[in-house]
Interface confidence: low
């Protein structure tokens, strides 16, 4: 199929990094500066993404691949391919429409991004609070009172730590 296609369409012979120039009898021309083609057989090259403003260049554009952006310090990526940059907040805060706000009592955020999440409810697991929660840290659940009674086995494996939920990247 590929051989037949190339006999019928000279453009299929143009490799990535070139475009098939209809104005030059379908000769493969190199992508000009600031543009790229990531696949063969392209009739135009695509212009390179610009990482400007809060975006900064993570990977330069080449003739065969687009530039990749990340965010300047104080911001983090959101969306596929870092399509947006969102402002960082401090630990113990979350980003709202009015800017960074402290986590409400009973919630925490241990990252510079994402939302405040409720403290773990130790009593749901039959445990007690060993270390109180803060805006920046979850509570630490300790053993239940029964675990501390005389004769209790000291080799009972601890319950797995509850992993804090991850906010979407």
């Amino acid at each position: 199929f590929e051989r037949t296609r190339s006999l019928q369409d000279p453009c299929s012979n143009c490799p990535a990094g070139t475009f098939c120039d209809n104005n030059r009898n379908q000769i493969c021309s190199p992508c000009p500066p600031n543009s790229f083609s990531s696949a063969g057989g392209q009739r135009t090259c695509d212009i390179c993404r610009q990482c400007k403003g809060v975006f900064r260049t993570r990977k330069e554009c080449s003739s065969t691949s687009n530039a990749e952006c990340d965010c300047t310090p104080g911001f983090h990526c959101l969306g596929a391919g870092c399509s947006m940059c969102e402002q960082d907040c401090k630990q113990g805060q979350e980003l709202t429409k009015k800017g960074c706000k402290d986590c409400c009592f009973g919630t925490f955020n241990d990252q510079k991004r994402g939302i405040c999440r409720p403290w773990t409810n130790c009593s749901l697991d039959g445990k007690s609070v060993l270390v109180n929660g803060t805006k920046e840290r979850d509570v630490v659940c300790g053993p239940s009172p029964a675990d501390l009674s005389p004769g209790a086995s000291s080799v009972t494996p601890p319950a797995p730590a509850r992993e804090p939920g991850h906010s979407p990247q």
Partner: antibody, heavy 120, light 111 residues
């Protein structure tokens, strides 16, 4: 400060070739591309092509394909535009213009222009 | 060779605002946010006024502003001054094999 200094005026006969130079100073030569643009008397601007001084890669307007050659000499920070098979309608002022990678090829600094007259 | 279409002339009195349109196609103005505007006084080289549709290089007065809607870009000159009398050209990166194209040019007259 950024400067683009072009070679002097030329008078050529039809069928001849002309080579115009553009010497850059005041910035890192290889970090900007260079346009060539021409303007016939009383007419508008016409894009001819662009050269990447780093590797010498070029892209020419289809109208000038086969007749124009753009080259560069990194040792002297100079770009050249040679136009062959001259005809009377090639009489124009030829400009070089520096363009930044990240600004959609906008020409931010321009040479003073070189008048090329084609006359028998 | 395709060119972008501009009105041949625009005029205004000192202090007034004027606009210059630049109409292209879905392969240039409509496709990319890479429209530039240039000012050219008689017997002088062009000077960059606007790039990337609406960005001003340092040293360019904020009386010059750019915008775009669909396939048409617009240059606005506010508080028109005598020294604004010149030719104005738009330019755009394009997806055609001729990778950059200029407008037809507009002569601005200050009455």
């Amino acid at each position: 400060q950024v400067q683009l200094v072009q070679s002097g005026a030329e008078v050529k006969k039809p069928g001849a070739s002309v080579k115009v130079s553009c010497k850059a100073s005041g910035y890192t030569f290889t970090t900007y591309y260079m346009h060539w643009v021409r303007q016939a008397p009383g007419q508008g601007l016409e894009w001819m092509g662009i050269i990447n001084p780093t590797g010498g890669s070029t892209s020419y307007a289809q109208k000038f394909q086969g007749r124009v050659t753009m080259t560069r000499d990194t040792s002297t920070s100079t770009v050249y535009m040679e136009l062959s098979s001259l005809r009377s309608e090639d009489t124009a002022v030829y400009y070089c213009a520096r363009t930044e990678y990240s600004s959609g090829w906008a020409g931010d600094y321009w040479g003073q222009g070189t008048l090329v007259t084609v006359s028998s | 060779q395709s060119v972008l279409t501009q009105p041949p002339s625009v005029s205004g009195s000192p202090g007034q605002s004027i606009t210059i349109s630049c109409t292209g196609t879905s392969r240039d103005v409509g496709l990319y946010n890479y429209v530039s505007w240039y000012q050219q006084h008689p017997d002088k080289a062009p000077k960059l006024l606007i790039y990337d549709v609406s960005e001003r290089p340092s040293g360019i007065s904020n009386r010059f502003s750019g915008s775009k809607s669909g396939n048409t870009a617009t240059l606005t000159i506010s508080g028109l001054q005598p020294e604004d009398e010149a030719d104005y050209y738009c330019g755009s990166y394009t997806s055609s094999s001729t990778r950059y194209v200029f407008g037809t040019g507009t002569k601005v007259t200050v009455l």
